[in-house]
């Protein structure tokens, strides 16, 4: 279930925008980055898609938001929330957050000025 996140811009607008896009390619891209091509992460068939392709698909999805710049933090928070339970330890959580904060730059978007990724009731 989606919980209410701290909003940077127009809250209802950002929520609708994040709801409308498919964040799976971003989740897959970041998992690929932190786990490489390890076979242990078999919940997604990530070996068949090159990392750069996955990154472009992720950027493509983020670009579908009406205002990606304004709602980027909400998108990053949702990705974090979606993947939180899959992150096995604290080190993996930190790696995931690091990669997540690099995502806007990888996609040539401006990074949000402030974005708190401590979502999911402290689990992550």
């Amino acid at each position: 279930m989606r919980r209410e996140r701290g909003r940077q811009g127009d809250s209802s607008s950002c929520e609708r925008q994040v709801d409308r896009v498919n964040l799976k390619p971003c989740e897959q891209h970041i998992m690929q980055r932190i786990m490489g091509e390890q076979e242990q992460y078999d919940s997604y068939d990530i070996r068949s898609t090159r990392s750069s392709d996955q990154q472009q698909r992720c950027c493509d999805e983020l670009n579908e938001m009406e205002n990606t710049q304004r709602c980027m933090c909400e998108a990053l928070q949702q990705i974090m929330e979606n993947q939180c339970d899959r992150l096995q330890d604290r080190q993996m959580v930190q790696q995931f957050k690091r990669e997540l904060m690099n995502l806007p730059q990888q996609c040539n978007f401006r990074a949000p000025q402030r974005c708190d990724l401590d979502v999911s009731g402290g689990r992550c």
Partner: antibody
Framework: EVQLVESGGGLVKPGGSLRLSCAAS????????MSWVRQAPGKGLEWVSY????????YYADSLKGRFTISRDNTENSVYLQMSSLRAEDTGVYYC????????????WGRGTLVTVSS | QSVLTQPPSVSGAPGQRVTISCTGS?????????VHWYQQFPGSAPHVLIY???QRPSGVPDRFSASKSGTSASLAITGLQADDEADYYC????????????FGGGTKLTVL
Amino acid sequence: EVQLVESGGGLVKPGGSLRLSCAASGFILSRSSMSWVRQAPGKGLEWVSYISSTSSHIYYADSLKGRFTISRDNTENSVYLQMSSLRAEDTGVYYCARKTNGAWFLDLWGRGTLVTVSS
Amino acid sequence: QSVLTQPPSVSGAPGQRVTISCTGSSSNIGAGSDVHWYQQFPGSAPHVLIYGNNQRPSGVPDRFSASKSGTSASLAITGLQADDEADYYCQSYDYDLSGSWVFGGGTKLTVL
């Protein structure tokens, strides 16, 4: 120079087909989402179709669904609009335009190509 | 009929201030979507005049400004000049339409 150049317009009979091309230069097309916008003579702008950078999102104006098909070939730096079952009301200048990265507006436009549907 | 409503024409004398309105609904401007404005001279392609409700691209004079409130937006031009005579279009994003792109019908600005 960063530019878009449309081609493929011309005179076609009602019921006929036409394929418009949009050649991009000066920027990386594969990272850009693109749209076609048309303008009937003496009328306003009407959005026609949209294709995202990886082609995973394709949209059409409701009035055109089923008759027009947008596609792209990033290796050829081109975007296309295949138009079929053309009608007189499809007459106008067709513009190719680039969606800006991170926001929902068109920051680069071609000069347009004229499509005339007449018997 | 356009999803966004603009007056078909406005006019003003050189040096005057004119405004062009753009009225939408709760599924586009009223839903928080940004409004963008394009200028089009006869025989030319449109180009962005204002983006993100009130941002001017480099090269656009500060005589052009825009604002947004509720379900509508407006473009203001101060110190009107002869070469401002053109068509002006607003554009936004609509959550209820599959394509999302929506334009206003356009406003012809005549400098008297």
